[in-house]
């Protein structure tokens, strides 16, 4: 019998909104932050199936704003959930002078302030060695499929759902599913969770292939253990 006590789950009702306080904020780069939110108790886990995401909800300028994010923490983590988010500041991109409503709201949040979480959301479920469930739409039952090799393409903060899956698979010694990731960024400095990805590539060379593509590749020599730099994004156009 499993004697391990079942941790209380935060996201028990996918339609409910759960207020969670901001407990930590870390600057990862000039425009990227790690936000840590506290769960209802130190024993709580988020309760997010691998492949799913959460929604954050806030009233901003008198309208309800809802945005989807994949945590970089997992249900091995108790008492908190971590999100890595790129802040879209106003007056940076000429096409989006107002910037991102939710990301700027998060950037301005003070420690202790709360935001509503809702979930789990999503149509993809990873059930264990190679077993995937994919819902044709949000209301249908997941269709089961078996994969021995997963191909992933991500850009910028889009790495978060891939990281969730990569971590889950490589943590499980019985899961031999192969993964190949093409990770696109603007510059070398923009590569999020680079150390962790390269460490996984180095320790799981037969299971995980890592490829970078950069809009503005470095001029000098390239050094990335376990990763290959493709000359530029145009190779995939």
């Amino acid at each position: 019998m499993n004697s391990r006590r079942r941790e209380p789950i935060t996201l028990q009702d996918p339609e409910a909104k759960y207020p969670l306080p901001l407990i930590e904020k870390e600057k990862i780069s000039h425009n990227t932050r790690r936000f840590r939110f506290g769960l209802p108790s130190p024993d709580h886990v988020l309760g997010l199936p691998v492949g799913n995401y959460v929604q954050l909800l806030a009233k901003i300028d008198n309208e309800l704003v809802v945005r989807a994010y994949t945590p970089v923490s997992s249900d091995d983590d108790r008492g908190f959930v971590d999100l890595i988010i790129k802040i879209y500041f106003k007056n940076v991109h000429p096409q989006y002078p107002e910037g991102g409503k939710m990301t700027q709201y998060l950037e301005n949040m003070k420690i202790g302030e709360t935001i509503f979480f809702r979930g789990p959301r999503g149509r993809l479920f990873y059930h264990g060695p190679g077993n995937l469930g994919i819902r044709p739409d949000q209301t249908s039952e997941p269709k089961k499929t078996l994969a021995d090799h997963l191909g992933m393409i991500a850009g910028g903060t889009g790495i978060t759902p891939m990281l969730q899956l990569i971590r889950h698979i490589t943590k499980d010694p019985s899961d031999r599913t192969r993964m190949s990731l093409i990770f696109a960024n603007q510059t070398e400095e923009d590569i999020l969770v680079r150390k962790e990805l390269e460490e996984i590539a180095r320790t799981h060379p037969d299971q995980f292939d890592l490829w970078y593509t950069l809009d503005r590749p470095p001029i000098g020599p390239w050094s990335a253990e376990g990763a290959t730099l493709l000359s530029n994004s145009a190779q995939f156009h």
């Epitope: 209380p8 009702d13 339609e15 409910a16 909104k17 806030a58 009233k59 008198n62 003070k110 509503f116």
Partner: antibody
Framework: QLQLQESGPGLVKPSETLSLTCTVA??????????WAWIRQPPGKGLEWIGS???????YHNPSLRSRGTILVDTSKNQFSLKLSSVTAADTGLYYC???????????????WGQGTLVTVSS | ENVLTQSPGTLSLSPGERATLSCRAS???????LAWYQQKSGQAPRLLIY???SRATGIPDRFSGSGSGTDFTLTISRLEPEDFAVYYC??????????FGPGTKVDIK
């Protein structure tokens, strides 16, 4: 029409546990967008939020009372309850149960209240 | 804790007059997360305004709310006899999740 009704003993001895129940009529306590709250008002004073619960049992408490307060939900009876331990005279007051369903889809304010029940802490 | 302060403590006015009630927060409040309640003697509070400026269902248009940041106002354009009561502001967010102001009593001069 939604109605909330508080019930419980009106007199509690110091150091004992105050127990109140709120019965919800006219709507299901299990709706995803509803939270259910306890709010109190000492005689002649202002309002103090005690805590809230959602139908799944997740609770949020006022830190000033957290160690003493327990809120539970019973969806089969469409009720939620409050237990406040180690009471003192400072816990005397009107205790209200309320719903926060949230205008504009977020549960930010209390839009339905019970009529309140007076609890006196005295030996 | 975000402390709400209401002023004045008591407002003595006559029916037909305009009432202006203030609510000040010790820290910034998301204006969408501020509400006002009315409590008549011997009754439970009733929601008047949510999101700083939106009237709750069934609330007459003589009640209006405004403000942002740390300063919020409830205005009753022309006091009716039934408006003499205690008014509370309330904010959501932070710890505790909900806090109320101490109240402003509007009584008949």
């Amino acid at each position: 029409q939604l109605q909330l009704q508080e019930s419980g003993p009106g007199l509690v001895k110091p150091s004992e546990t105050l127990s109140l129940t709120c019965t919800v009529a006219g709507d299901s306590i299990s709706r995803s967008n509803y939270y259910w709250a306890w709010i109190r008002q000492p005689p002649g004073k202002g309002l103090e939020w005690i805590g809230s619960i959602i139908h799944t049992g997740t609770t949020y408490h006022n830190p000033s009372l957290r160690s003493r307060g327990t809120i539970l939900v019973d969806t089969s009876k469409n009720q939620f309850s409050l237990k406040l331990s180690s009471v003192t005279a400072a816990d005397t007051g009107l205790y209200y149960c309320a719903r926060h369903s949230g205008h504009d889809q977020l549960p930010l304010d209390f839009d339905n209240w019970g009529q309140g029940t007076l609890v006196t802490v005295s030996s | 804790e975000n402390v709400l302060t209401q002023s004045p403590g008591t407002l003595s006015l006559s029916p037909g007059e305009r009432a202006t009630l203030s609510c000040r927060a010790s820290q910034r409040v998301n204006s969408n997360y501020l509400a006002w309640y009315q409590q008549k003697s011997g009754q439970a509070p009733r929601l008047l305004i949510y999101g700083a400026s939106s009237r709750a269902t069934g609330i007459p248009d003589r009640f209006s709310g405004s403000g942002s940041g740390t300063d919020f106002t409830l205005t009753i354009s022309r006091l009716e006899p039934e408006d003499f009561a205690v008014y509370y502001c309330q904010q959501y967010g932070g710890s505790p999740l909900f806090t109320f102001g101490p109240g402003t009593k509007v009584d008949i001069k």
